[in-house]
Interface confidence: low
């Protein structure tokens, strides 16, 4: 399981007249459910239950976004509509270029994502936990426009980073 280097850029326009970018670097792991590839896109937060909806007319986004899903404690969803892997597949079917799972509340999901699938997704499926997950969800919960850049190596030079 390789380390996924995730750079999240929160991007907003302030009334004072400046674009403000906040960059947060965090690490996760590429799971065996997906490919070990770089990916980049606008973050779309998805509720785990939102991925249950089978109506393809709903919750469709333009291609190229990064889905972020905070998994609930298993006790809160004893009979999930889809496995974690199924949720990742559903997100990719809807146009996600990558999926990031916060597994802090559901560490069992790590094993589910790493069970060697015969047909892994062609897009990266990353999981984060602990402090990295807290940082990620803190940004996502701001409901601002944000981008995630996922790499399978650390950014090579400072110029690859957005300014803090």
């Amino acid at each position: 399981k390789e380390t996924a280097f995730v750079e999240v850029v929160l991007f907003e326009s302030s009334p004072s007249g400046d674009y403000t970018t906040y960059t947060t670097g965090l690490t996760g792991r590429f799971s065996r459910a997906g490919a070990t590839l770089s990916a980049e896109g606008e973050i779309v937060q998805m509720h785990p239950l939102g991925l249950c909806n089978n109506n393809d007319e709903e919750d469709l986004y333009e291609y190229g976004w990064v889905g972020v899903v905070k998994l609930e404690q298993p006790e809160l969803d004893p009979k999930p509509c889809l496995t974690v892997l199924g949720k990742a597949k559903r997100a990719v079917q809807r146009g996600a270029t990558a999926v990031i799972f916060d597994v802090s509340e559901n560490p069992e999901a790590i094993d589910q994502l790493n069970q060697g699938s015969e047909d892994p997704l062609k897009r990266p499926v990353v999981y984060v936990k602990g402090a990295d997950a807290i940082k990620l969800m803190n940004i996502v919960n701001k409901q601002k426009v944000a981008r995630a850049r996922i790499q399978h190596r650390p950014p090579r030079q400072p110029t690859e980073y957005f300014d803090m």
């Epitope: 907003e12 326009s13 007249g17 400046d18 426009v145 944000a146 110029t159 980073y161």
Partner: antibody, heavy 117, light 107 residues
């Protein structure tokens, strides 16, 4: 598909105001800030400002501060740009354009505003 | 304000030529740079964002590179529909600013 449809051409006298509308469809209106960019005849592109449809916050270019007002109506997914104290050099095509993390990915068809006495 | 200087201001080229347009920012803008194509009487069209990312639906003959202050738009093999004016634009800080444009004409 994403569409930004602007109001029709306007002819105004110097000193008057003009209000251009831009109706968005095909995406979640609140999720994407909207820019206004203008282009004088035969000239380049000039950024005027941006509005965040979610909260209504705005950011204007210094050049237009005090003369431009950008508003939005979330019930109709429409943004508005009003420019006051018009002068002949404000004659231009005015575009609304959707922001997607720094780039402007969709543009309206443009509204020609002519300022002439 | 960040000044964006584009060069050349115009160029003549033939179908099949490789065309390169450069854009220089007056200060570092990381990769907050986009390239647009505009044809007479039409709205600009996004080609490249984040300096090097190709917008969906744009032909792969268009490519962008650069970071910091110096950026390049390359058209690998010019097609008849590519004759237009091209603009770079920074979104690192407000006010957003555009380059003066490069008009690509038929030789």
């Amino acid at each position: 598909q994403v569409q930004l449809v602007q109001s029709g051409a306007e002819v105004k006298k110097p000193g008057a105001s003009v209000k251009v509308s831009c109706k968005a469809s095909g995406y979640t209106f609140r999720r994407y800030p909207m820019h206004w960019v203008r282009q004088a005849p035969g000239q380049g592109l000039e950024w005027m400002g941006i509005i965040n449809p979610s909260g209504g916050s705005t950011s204007y270019a210094q050049k237009f501060q005090g003369r431009v007002t950008m508003t939005r109506d979330t019930s109709t997914s429409t943004v508005y740009m009003e420019l006051s104290s018009l002068r002949s050099e404000d004659t231009a095509v005015y575009y609304c354009a959707r922001d997607k993390v720094g780039a402007i990915d969709y543009w309206g068809q443009g509204t020609l505003v002519t300022v002439s006495s | 304000d960040i000044q964006m200087t584009q060069s050349p201001s115009s160029l003549s080229a033939s179908v099949g030529d490789r065309v390169t347009i450069t854009c220089r920012a007056s200060q570092g803008i990381s990769n907050y740079l986009a390239w647009y194509q505009q044809k007479p009487g039409k709205a600009p069209k996004l080609l490249i964002y984040a300096a090097s990312s190709l917008q969906r639906g744009v032909p792969s003959r268009f490519s962008g590179s650069g970071s910091g202050t110096d950026f390049t738009l390359t058209i690998s093999s010019l097609q008849p529909e590519d004759f237009a004016t091209y603009y770079c634009q920074q979104s690192y800080s407000t006010p957003l600013t555009f380059g003066g444009g490069t008009k690509v004409e038929i030789k």
